[in-house]
């Protein structure tokens, strides 16, 4: 960018004068002129003259920032536009406002929904332009300073522009460009085009900017590559350039973007859940736990706004209290806590559970698991721990219909010292009227009653849910409330469980592991037969399959297990869907006797149900992302179901589906994913390309390069990225491989003269520019070009220095003859 | 037969409001992507709104030129379409077409479509 | 957004002669499953537009095969081999790859 003459101002307060463009480069040959060959500037020579400082008494200054009480003055600028342009613009990030005829972004407001994204968030076109101010002096000593707050949502940081005479002529840079974006978000970079030289550096630092936050360094120089993308976690990002000497690489171009952030998915607390509104600011997280046990912490949490969007407080958790009094208690659990912990491993848990007045408890007994020489569980019937005991786990069998107090309030006491064998405790409390019975309790069942308030006379008829069976089994399945003086059962509660086998003839049923949910036992050989109308057929949805190593699920497409063998599942699996030919399907599951294989084990949950044996194939999921078209309007063999997905996304499988013979589809049904690969960029002509990775997904890289005597025009390598809107791009547009030209070689410095910064060779378009010692005059070509072709020539011969007949200094300069 | 009919066209004023509406039969209405383009008088065709199928969720997707001025909807019990276009502009003047997915794409079949004049 | 740009914007054509209209899209339109999201229309004059092509060289339901589509990547061609009366309009080129969907500014085919 060149200088006019009124950007050069002295230092407010220094003596200097102003000076223009011209006179500085004057100033500088000047100091060269008064060097003979004497002072070691001799041709070939590698030193760089444009480090030489000015004479004693020559200094000469470029203003620092202006001041808001200075609008006259303005350093060397350049403006950086969202779209890369570069151009003349305003400059002083301290300005209070913009000179006439500029915009400035406003600054961040807390009150503004986000920064503003470009046409691709849906917004229309804005282009503000952003300012990279460069601040020159040529004092050797004093860097050049080129720093700029940005507050765009999206745009390009460029190098200092070196093609000013001054940028030519001076020294050190020490240049920091701040992006600084609205809380909430982050800033993703892609390193555009990069080329420094090993003296200079780079540094990309997420943060900062806040009282007590310092920023954490991403990455230097060694670390960058052209095409690599780099976020910041935080809504600040500073990249820090220096060069201790002219910069002599090409420079550096990084393109940056806003991107939303958003709290993490807050873990679910053991023995409770989470459900959350939405992880972006504002969102909130309301966690709750399992019956009987409590939050520890806060019950609700909220995604907050800032630098980097956090929760407003630690995840609570759910504890199984040792122990406590539950006033007015209606319905609830007693469960025992985690061994270990907090508790340690000896405990010695009492919980106290009052009624209301005139109420009585019941105490259903759910799971337990005490080791026989180090826990023990006892229940008294009543408040304290000298009232009677009415359960005690040394001397007694688990009641199967649970337990009744006589008074209003039950003491359990539960002693563990350093268990064998892991400790477990569920008990399900109840209160009740004492003129009535206690409601019963099915697990994985229902009750149905004949009086809500069970009264004495009152029926309760018992029936499981499907894949359970009643526990004793057969009638009766239903118990009677006796005795108005003290009412009370006639028969123990049943219990509902998975069974080893057994028939189903429903149209629709689960087949459940034995002893499902807990863990199946070693030593099973379970068969289920499944019947459904002799005209249907059954569909079986395999939901939960998680079998132990060894052991195994085999379906037979029949009845019995001398039919044809439909599927054998094992171990952990996924979910699927069988069809069997005809109305019956047999299940047989073997688990070998001895200890337990290692492995899950926990069991499975299969689903089935009858359908009709019309000669179609199952019915199929619709497709998200996108939509299928079917040849017929039913599934009958031969239909065909063409899948398709809608923009921004991919078929990932068969796009099309066949019904075949055997009514099972060709193929499993595809599904749409978001697109997250870049299309190929193409070859290159005169060139070869080195890809990271087959497919081209986002992050990958694609590195072009040229034959020998072809040179590389753009970037040299390709990032994939992904956005937000629309599919994955490449960072830049495919380069070319543009046949080199042969540089000019150096045509030799005349006698009594010298050339500026003398190199060997000379590529095509660039120019050398001689001068003659003092005494001399220049005949010919002050200055002359490499014209490019094979082989690349110079325009002219270099000029001769012959001794001039005067001495006015104006002439060596202007090289007249 | 697929069948697609829009009406509500007509003349507005700038700042003005107006309804489109879409009559589909043939088809399960609820099974189908519907979208909305438009034609500028002796110009092109420019996509203009777009609504999901029952399996996804009905959500909706806007070109940026009309993106919080109008609104796309469907009445599912009606087999109906609509475009609410509110704070109508000049360049608003279109024949707009109502448009539904299929075997080939999202835009297989279309309607014969309305014209809506933005004029003062 | 995908800039769809088509060339020529009008092409004089004798029946009974070959006609070729390109489409180039600025981001290439292939992917990974091996399909170009890419559609012709043709719409007669006071007619809605009608599907001839898609994913770039499949023919519509009911398309004679004297329509036939062709290309790579970002440039596409529409061939007419030989044209009939019932051609002629404005040929749309139209891409599906991503929100928002962009169609070309079309290609007038009119009788010499």
């Known amino acids: 960018l060149p200088l006019k003459e009124e950007e050069i101002l002295p230092e407010p307060g220094s003596e200097t004068p102003t000076v223009a463009s011209e006179a500085l480069a004057e100033l500088l040959h000047g100091a060269l002129l008064r060097r003979g060959p004497e002072m070691g500037y001799l041709p070939g020579s590698d030193r760089d003259p444009t480090l030489a400082t000015p004479p004693a008494g020559q200094t000469l200054a470029v203003p620092s920032l202006p001041r808001a009480t200075e609008p006259g003055t303005g350093p060397l600028t350049t403006a950086v536009t969202p779209n890369g342009v570069r151009g003349a613009g305003p400059t002083a990030p301290e300005l209070l406002t913009p000179p006439p005829g500029t915009t400035a972004p406003p600054p961040p407001s807390p009150a503004s929904p986000g920064p503003p994204l470009g046409p691709e968030g849906g917004e229309e076109e804005t282009t503000t332009t952003i300012i990279t101010t460069t601040t020159v002096t040529t004092t050797v000593t004093s860097p050049v300073l080129c720093n700029n707050n940005i507050s765009e949502g999206e745009g390009y940081v460029e190098s200092p522009d070196l093609g000013s005479p001054v940028s030519r002529t001076l020294g050190l840079l020490d240049c920091t460009y701040s992006i600084h974006v609205y809380p909430g978000y982050g800033i993703e970079i892609q390193v555009q085009t990069l080329n420094l030289s090993q003296e200079e550096e780079l540094l990309v630092l997420a943060g900062g900017g806040s009282p007590g936050l310092a920023p954490r360094l991403l990455a230097n120089s060694s670390m960058l590559g052209e095409g690599q993308v780099l976020r910041s976690p935080t809504n600040r990002l500073l990249l820090h350039f220096q060069s201790p000497r002219v910069p002599r690489g090409g420079g550096f171009r990084i393109h940056y973007q806003a991107y939303l952030l958003s709290c993490g998915f807050p873990p679910r607390p053991a023995h409770g859940d989470v459900s959350v509104t939405d992880l972006h600011p504002g969102g909130t997280a309301t966690f709750h736990c399992d019956s009987g046990y409590q939050l520890q912490g806060e019950e609700t949490l909220i995604c907050l706004n800032g630098t980097r969007p956090s929760w407003n407080g630690e995840t609570p958790s759910c504890m199984a209290s040792c122990g406590g009094t539950i006033h007015n208690a209606t319905l609830g659990r007693i469960v025992s806590p985690e061994p270990g912990g907090a508790v340690g491993p000896n405990l010695t848990c009492r919980w106290v559970i009052e009624a209301a007045e005139g109420r009585r408890l019941h105490l259903h007994f759910e799971r337990v698991s005490l080791d026989e020489d180090n826990d023990r569980l006892m229940v008294r019937s009543g408040g304290s721990p000298l009232s009677p005991v009415i359960y005690d786990s040394d001397m007694d069998d688990v009641p199967e219909r649970g337990l009744i107090s006589d008074a209003q309030s039950l003491y359990v006491e539960l002693l563990s010292e350093t268990p064998a064998n892991p400790l477990l405790l569920s008990l399900r409390f109840e209160a009740f009227e004492e003129d009535r019975c206690f409601a019963p309790f099915l697990a994985h069942g229902n009750v149905t009653t004949t009086d809500p308030e069970y009264r004495p006379g009152a029926l309760a008829t018992f029936s499981c849910l499907p894949g359970y069976a009643l526990e004793p089994p057969g009638p009766p399945n239903a118990i009677e409330c006796v005795d108005p003086t003290e009412p009370h059962w006639n028969d123990t509660e049943p219990a509902c469980k998975a069974m080893c086998g057994g028939e189903l003839s429903e149209p629709a049923g689960v087949v459940l592991s034995p002893d499902w949910p807990q863990s199946y036992s070693p030593g099973q050989d379970c068969v289920w037969g499944v019947h459904v109308q002799e005209e249907k057929r059954i569909l079986l949805q395999v939901e939960i399959l998680n079998v132990r190593e060894g052991d195994m699920l085999t379906l037979f497409d029949g009845d019995g297990p001398s039919a044809r063998v439909l599927a054998q599942l094992r171990g952990p699996q996924p979910r699927r869907r069988l069809l069997s030919s005809g109305p019956d399907l047999t299940l047989q599951f073997q688990a070998p006797p001895g200890p337990p294989n290692p492995g899950l084990g926990q069991g499975f949950v299969l689903h089935f149900k009858e359908v009709p044996r019309n000669d179609t194939c199952p019915e199929l999921p619709p497709p998200e992302w996108g939509w299928r078209t079917a040849s017929h309007g039913d599934l009958i063999r031969g239909t065909v179901l063409t899948y398709q997905c809608e923009p921004g996304y991919e078929l990932l499988g068969s796009d099309i589906l066949t019904c075949q013979w055997d009514l099972s589809w060709s193929a499993a049904p595809p599904a749409c994913q978001k697109i997250m690969t870049c299309a190929d960029p193409g070859e290159i002509a005169n060139g070869h390309r080195t890809a990271s990775d087959a497919g081209f997904p986002v992050g990958s890289h694609v590195q072009y390069r040229c034959l020998p005597g072809y040179s590389l025009e753009g970037a040299a390598m390709l990032t994939c990225y992904s956005r937000d809107t629309g599919t994955p791009k490449w960072s830049d547009r495919v380069p070319k491989c543009a046949l080199k030209y042969e540089p000019c070689l150096n045509p030799g410095v005349p006698e009594n003269g010298y050339q500026t910064l003398y190199k060997h060779h000379y590529q095509a378009g660039e120019s050398l520019r001689f001068f003659c010692y003092e005494g001399f005059e220049l005949i010919g070509e002050v200055t002359i070009t490499c014209v490019p072709g094979h082989p690349s020539q110079w325009t002219s011969q270099p000029p001769l220095c012959k001794v001039t007949q005067t001495t006015d200094p104006s002439r060596q300069l202007e090289g007249g003859n | 037969e697929v069948q697609l009919v829009e009406s509500g066209g007509g003349l507005v004023q700038p700042g003005g409001s107006l309804r489109l509406s879409c009559a589909a039969s043939?088809?399960?209405?609820?099974?189908?992507?519907m979208s909305w383009v438009r034609q500028a008088p002796g110009k092109g065709l420019e996509w203009v709104a777009l609504?999901?199928?029952?399996?996804?969720?009905?959500?909706?997707e806007y070109s940026a030129s009309v993106k919080g001025r109008f609104t796309i909807s469907r009445d599912n019990s009606k087999n109906s379409l609509y475009l609410q276009m509110n704070s109508l502009r000049a360049e608003d003047t279109a024949v707009y077409y109502c448009?539904?997915?299929?075997?080939?794409?999202?835009?297989?079949?279309w309607g014969q479509g309305t014209l809506v004049t933005v004029s003062s | 957004d995908i800039v769809m740009t088509q060339t020529p914007l009008s092409i004089p054509v004798t029946p009974g002669e070959p006609a070729s209209i390109s489409c180039r899209s600025s981001?290439?339109?292939?992917?990974?499953?091996?399909?170009?999201?890419l559609y012709w229309y043709l719409q007669k004059p006071g007619q809605s537009p009608q599907l001839l092509i898609y994913?770039?060289?499949n023919l519509a339901s009911g398309v004679p095969d004297r329509f036939s589509g062709s290309g790579s990547g970002t440039d596409f061609t529409l061939k007419i081999s030989r044209v009939e009366a019932e051609d002629f309009g404005v040929y749309y080129c139209?891409?599906?790859?991503?929100?928002?969907?962009?169609f070309g500014a079309g290609t007038k085919v009119e009788i010499k």
């Open positions: 994913y770039m060289s």
């Open positions: 981001t290439s339109l292939l992917e990974s499953s091996g399909k170009h999201r």
């Open positions: 043939g088809f399960t209405f609820t099974d189908y992507y």
């Open positions: 448009a539904r997915n299929g075997l080939y794409g999202l835009f297989a079949y």
């Open positions: 609504i999901r199928n029952k399996a996804n969720g009905y959500t909706t």
């Open positions: 139209m891409q599906s790859l991503e929100y928002p969907l962009t």
